[in-house]
């Protein structure tokens, strides 16, 4: 039970996630005009991945978009990248993790494929939410540099009577909003591992004797000190010895000629 | 046609307030940004404070700020400027105008003004 | 606040001739994020209102003959009016539409020679 719900707590997380990622990339707001020196403006300026836009006081919003891919910063074109990366990675993800929700059956699909399957989105989660916080930091980073920039060329050159202040720009929402969904793709990312080692089989390390009814030989059947991955052979999820002790997973077994030595 | 009529304008000692009115007809008041502009008698054109279309945001000239409010109705299409403490260099031709929607900030559309004459 | 400049305060110019009319702001009204000059200029005639005739520094306005030009960038801005009319004769004003307060300038007076 506990599994099956940190499992979906997992899912939901990355969900919601990987939307604020998709969100924060088409934001416009990556960056805002600082209004520091000029609260008062009558046009202001904001920039995303995609475009640049102008709001102007009389409520007409202008925005052109970066029509060159060459003439464009590395930076934004490696922002961009990580970005799309992490939104490929996470839709990959929940793709993934919906089949491999315990809450849903298909088909026979054994416990040790779910399992294998919530690694893997947990996996794609985790690298999703690195890409998109890797992606708002080097932003913001870009951003930190070119205020303090900007500020120092604003403070130089002012000799004359006439003064041409340079726009200055701020962390926008688009920021926070990518900060938030990559954490939460990330802690999604945690959950649906940690909810694996719960849906693995596990195999315990003590002998055990199975006795079968319908034949004669008895078949001894040592643990052994396996290395215990989640991903041993045992597909049917059944412990060798239960202890009388049933879970609703387990179905009645037919003996197959790997059960005997 | 875009209209725009100014009214309430008056003689008034310095202390005292005064309501002006602006009535719009002939466009969408409520998508545009109005502005109240004052002229002196010495012919000088002054912006005395900016409303935005949904009300939400409202400049003023330091000189007014905390003295006049401006406001507007967009059910009645109407936009207010009101007065209060007035002194003598308040004394101009008050005008109502909008802010055109592509024109850059700038002043698409002017009413006739009224006249406000602040004297003891 | 931005102080507007104008030049020269009154100019008479003969029909048909260029008349030019200039205007200094103390900050630059030219926007980066869209490369626009935040600039408009008005004309008034006695007993009206004033009159939009140009606006982001060169666009002429709806209805506004074309012998009414903008040009400038920045800080420096001209008015020209390339071929003077009897119904030009008014006091033309800029304004900065870039920051608060929209300031005027204090206007020049335009008459025939």
């Known amino acids: 039970m506990a599994v099956t719900a940190c499992q979906g707590l997992g899912f939901v997380v990355s969900l919601i996630g990987i939307a604020g990622i998709i969100a924060a990339t088409c934001m416009d707001q990556w960056s805002t005009q600082d209004l520091y020196n000029n609260p008062v403006t009558a046009v202001f300026n904001y920039q995303g991945l995609w475009r640049s836009c102008v709001r102007e006081s009389s409520g007409f919003t202008e925005c052109r978009g970066y029509f060159t891919l060459l003439g464009l910063p590395a930076m934004l074109q490696a922002v961009r990248a990580l970005m799309i990366v992490g939104i490929v990675l996470g839709a990959i993800g929940l793709l993934v993790s919906i089949f491999a929700l315990k809450c849903i059956r298909i088909g026979s699909m054994e416990d040790s494929a779910k399992a294998n399957m919530t690694l893997t989105s947990g996996i794609m989660f985790i690298v999703s939410g690195l890409c998109a916080i890797a992606g708002v930091s080097v932003f913001a980073n870009m951003l930190v540099t070119n205020f303090w920039m900007s500020t120092a060329n604003m403070y130089t050159g002012m000799g004359g009577m006439v003064q041409t202040v340079q726009t200055r720009y701020t962390f926008g929402a688009a920021l926070f909003v990518g900060w938030v969904a990559g954490g939460l793709t990330l802690i999604g990312g945690v959950m649906m591992c940690i909810a694996c080692r719960g849906l693995a089989p596990e195999e315990t390390n003590y002998k055990a004797v199975s006795y079968h009814a319908s034949g004669h030989s008895v078949a001894y059947k040592p643990g052994g000190f396996k290395a215990s991955t989640g991903f041993g052979s045992n597909t049917k999820n059944k412990k060798i010895y239960d202890g009388g002790a049933r879970t609703e997973d387990e179905v009645q077994s037919y003996p197959s000629k790997h059960d005997y030595v | 046609e875009v209209m725009l009529v100014e009214s309430g304008g008056g003689v008034v000692q310095p202390g005292g307030s005064l309501r002006l009115s602006c009535a719009a007809s002939g466009f969408t008041f409520s998508t545009y940004t109005m502005s109240w502009v004052r002229q002196t008698p010495e012919k000088r054109l002054e912006w005395v404070a900016t409303i935005v279309g949904g009300g939400g945001y409202t400049y003023y000239l330091d000189s007014v700020k905390g003295r006049f409010t401006i406001s507007r109705d967009n059910a009645k299409n109407t936009l207010y400027l009101q007065m209060n403490s007035l002194r003598t260099e308040d004394t101009a031709l008050y005008y109502c105008?909008?802010?055109?929607?592509?024109?850059?900030?700038?002043?698409?559309?002017w009413g006739q003004g009224t006249l406000i004459t602040v004297s003891s | 606040d931005i102080v507007m400049t104008q030049s020269p305060d009154s100019l008479a110019v003969s029909l048909g001739e260029r008349a030019t009319i200039n205007c200094k702001s103390s900050?630059?009204?030219?926007?980066?994020?869209?490369?626009?000059?935040?600039l408009a200029w008005y004309q008034q005639k006695p007993g009206q209102p004033p009159k939009l005739l140009i606006y982001g520094a060169s666009t002429r306005e709806s209805g506004v003959p074309d012998r009414f030009s903008g040009s400038g960038f920045g800080t420096d801005f001209t008015l020209t009016i390339s071929s003077l009319q009897a119904e030009d004769v008014a006091v033309y004003y800029c304004?900065?539409?870039?920051?608060?307060?929209?300031?005027f300038g204090a206007g020049t007076k335009l008459e025939i020679k």
């Open positions: 900050q630059s009204l030219f926007n980066s994020g869209n490369q626009k000059n935040y």
């Open positions: 105008a909008r802010m055109g929607l592509t024109q850059r900030n700038a002043l698409d559309y």
């Open positions: 304004q900065n539409d870039h920051t608060y307060p929209l300031t």
